[in-house]
């Protein structure tokens, strides 16, 4: 998106003040995922807890099948943070045996869906190659940024591999997002 | 929470205008830990550099005794982050004896009390395994995410063992809250 | 920054309302990187994509020689994810034949540079040791904190070595900011 | 493979509520947004509005707005266009298609002729 | 309503030519999209996002410009290509679609 400069005057006649409590709100907790069908190529989107524990969404930011809901135009920050969890990885063993291998990764997507592009759009990712020797092992990807959204965009969080992501706390594994 | 909705008219009379410069804000950053009690099945809680260097809290929002306060209920975005250092962890050296182990691991959780709640609340936690071989390590734990708190609760960071955590630069470790 | 206590009617004579839509902001993507020269105690900046694609610079934040602009004073959130990717580190290598070795390193600096102050200010610091057998690897750091920033100040990332720096993809390494 | 079906009928009187159906198969559409398109004999296309299935949210083309109503139903993978109070100006080929989770895809288009 | 003007309305040419197509938009958008409609068919999206060439579409098809003005491009006319084509914009409500461009083989 091409940055739009306006001068404060101009700026200020579109963008009436609003009281900030107002505002689209979101936070989503991890739940236990039930496997899904997902497109070939695309990785598979979480589906979330939004009103029990911590989990909130407020001000017209809904909740629906995986998607989070933008019901107007704006600046939001959007974060979410999984936490992965496996056994040994693959890669790890091949190389006791020392031959170098592309590492297993685990990855996390956060996408954009909007009826004005064909594609689903990447707005972060995070991705990290995983190759632990001899035991279980587990971590977590965070990401957080700034974008320009749409009333009626759609927001989800891919992931490499659903059967690695950590469901059993809502502070492990998280979606959020607010209109600045 | 269940997710509250409101027609804008009925939020804007209850959510007054106000100015961003006067919201509750504050960003605390590392200092030498010196080592307290802890109850045995609680990670001990750090504290912080409240005012010097790139440290403020302001706004009524205030730091005391480790825990930040918070002075007004509303939606807030707290993050922290947790720079990590280590020697080789046990679990690598039990490992090239050809045993796998329970991994060390590293964690930081950010914990809220409130006083009319007997028990803490874990609102965020990163958690991960460390298995190097044979050198130092460090590594940064991040997390950041926004929840509706009440006035008069209590903020806190806590880890899974203080004398890991790198308190050398107040960039590396940090702690911080602002109302949205 | 001594943290600044107004009572909130003092406040509110000095912080007029606005729009929030009329606050300064940026997110910027990453770009392949030119080498460039750099301080030999200085980690090189990196530059950015600052109007196409996810980024895009508004109301007066501009960004200019690998500087994101601060137009105005006041509270900024600030965030940069890199990514990194390397072939097998040394101290691997190293350590296979028993030594421990000090271990090959990532790091992360989003740096404040003030007219006024003749050195930079480190504002976040993500260092990460890393000391992977046998294959490539690839893993994020992300940082994101608030800080009371001056018109006038220049923000910029640093890194530990821009050639392990992954400018494939704008969802993987971005750099943003905004007025709170 | 992905596959969108217009159904309804192809005659409709004067005055009368239009109704078309658009099932949807090969994917699942929750992921994406549906439109109606419509094209008049020898005109160009024109585009009547859209549905987010996910959330029944819509938007219509402000000049059929008081007329047009889409809806969708989940269970059956199913978006429906009504138009009311037809006139033969509204004689056309009614297009169902997809945009947003994926390329676009169009359905083969319904022709919807409205006549006493 | 942003309002979209297609030139020509209609072009004949050779095959093997280059072929261009204009849209002018009454107001700046960010976007265009092209859609190519064979007689009888449902349109097919060609480019999106003013220069995307959508999957499985041949390379010969490009777009590009700005703000109002937009340009689509077939760099060597081939027989099955003969089809009316059409741009969208999809920012303003409603979204809007040029009146169409009639290419046929000289």
């Known amino acids: 998106l091409k940055g739009q400069e306006f001068a404060p005057s101009h700026q200020q006649v579109y963008a009436p003040l609003r009281a900030d409590g107002d505002k689209p709100r979101a936070h989503l907790t991890v739940v236990r995922q039930t496997p899904t069908q997902h497109l070939k190529n695309q990785f598979p989107a979480l589906h979330w807890e939004h009103e029990l524990g911590l989990a909130f969404t407020k001000n017209r930011m809904n909740y629906t099948n995986k998607f989070l809901l933008i019901p107007e135009s704006g600046d939001y920050f959007v974060y979410s943070q999984v936490t992965f969890r496996g056994m040994t990885s693959e890669c790890s063993e091949i190389r006791q045996a020392g031959r170098p291998n592309k590492p297993d990764s685990i990855t996390v997507v956060i996408t954009k869906v909007t009826d004005s592009y064909p594609e689903p759009t990447q707005l972060l990712m995070g991705t990290k190659s995983v190759c632990e020797v001899g035991s279980n092992w587990f971590q977590p990807i965070y990401l957080g940024a700034m974008f320009s959204l749409q009333e009626g965009d759609k927001l989800m969080v891919n992931v490499s591999d659903i059967s690695l992501v950590d469901y059993t706390k809502e502070d492990k594994t998280f979606f959020g997002a607010f209109l600045l | 929470l269940k997710g509250q909705e409101f027609a804008p008219s009925h939020q804007q009379v209850y959510a007054p205008l106000r100015a961003d410069g006067d919201k509750p804000r504050a960003h605390l950053t590392v200092v030498r830990q010196t080592p307290t009690q802890h109850l045995k099945n609680q990670f001990p809680a750090l504290h912080w550099e409240h005012e010097l260097g790139l440290a403020f809290t302001k706004n009524r929002m205030n730091y005391t005794n480790k825990f930040l306060l918070i002075p007004e209920s509303g939606d807030y975005f707290v993050y922290s982050q947790v720079t990590f250092r280590g020697m080789t962890s046990e679990c690598s050296e039990i490992r090239q004896a050809g045993r796998p182990n329970k991994p060390d691991s590293i964690t930081v959780v950010i914990t809220k009390v409130t006083d009319s709640y007997p028990e803490p609340t874990q609102l965020l936690m990163g958690t991960k395994s460390v298995c190097e071989v044979g050198s130092n390590w460090f590594q940064p734990i991040y997390l950041g995410a926004m929840f509706s708190l009440q006035e008069g609760d209590k903020l806190m960071v806590n880890v899974s063992d203080i004398s890991l955590v790198d308190y050398t630069k107040e960039d590396k470790t940090f702690f911080g809250a602002f109302l949205l | 920054l001594k943290g600044q206590e107004f009572a909130p009617s003092h406040q509110q004579v000095y912080a007029p309302l606005r729009a929030d839509g009329d606050k300064p902001r940026a997110h910027l993507t990453v770009v392949r990187q030119t080498p460039t020269q750099h301080l030999k105690n200085q980690f090189p900046a990196l530059h950015w994509e600052h109007e196409l694609g996810l980024a895009f610079t508004k109301n007066r934040m501009n960004y200019t020689n690998k500087f994101l602009l601060i137009p105005e004073s006041g509270d900024y959130f600030v965030y940069s994810q890199v990514t990194f990717r390397g072939m097998t580190s040394e101290c691997s290598e190293i350590r296979q034949a028993g030594r421990p070795n000090k271990p090959d390193s990532i790091t992360v600096v989003i740096t404040k540079v003030t007219d006024s102050y003749p050195e930079p200010t480190q504002l976040l610091m993500g260092t990460k040791s890393v000391c992977e057998v046998g294959s490539n690897w690839f893993q994020p750091i992300y940082l994101g904190a608030m800080f009371s920033l001056q018109e006038g100040d220049k923000l910029m990332v640093n890194v530990s070595d821009i050639s392990l720096v992954d400018y494939t993809k704008e969802d993987k390494t971005f750099f943003g900011a905004f007025l709170l | 493979q992905v596959q969108l079906q217009e159904s309804g009928p192809g005659l409709v009187r004067p005055s009368q509520t239009l109704s078309l159906t658009c099932t949807v198969s090969?994917?699942?559409?929750?992921?994406?947004?549906m439109h109606w398109v419509r094209q008049r004999p020898g005109r160009g296309l024109e585009w009547m509005g859209r549905i987010d299935p996910a959330s029944g949210h819509t938007k219509y083309n402000p000049s059929l707005k008081s007329r047009v109503t889409i809806t969708r139903d989940t269970s059956k993978n199913q978006v429906s266009l009504r138009l009311s109070s037809v006139t033969a100006a509204d004689t056309a080929v009614y297009y169902c298609?997809?945009?947003?989770?994926?390329?676009?895809?169009w359905g083969q288009g319904s022709l919807v002729t409205v006549s006493s | 309503d942003i309002q979209m003007t297609q030139s020509p309305s209609s072009l004949s040419a050779s095959v093997g030519d280059r072929v261009t197509i204009t849209c002018r938009a009454s107001q700046g958008v960010e976007y265009m999209y092209w859609y190519q409609q064979k007689p009888g068919k449902a349109p097919k999206l060609l480019i999106y996002a003013t220069s995307n060439l959508a999957s499985g579409v041949p390379s010969r098809f490009s777009g590009s410009g700005s703000g109002t003005d937009f340009t689509f491009t077939i760099s060597s006319l081939q027989p099955e290509d003969i089809a009316t084509y059409y741009c969208q914009q999809w920012e303003g409500n409603p979204r809007t679609f040029g009146q169409g461009t009639k290419v046929e083989i000289k």
């Open positions: 090969g994917f699942d559409y929750q992921d994406t947004y």
């Open positions: 298609a997809v945009s947003g989770g994926m390329p676009d895809v």
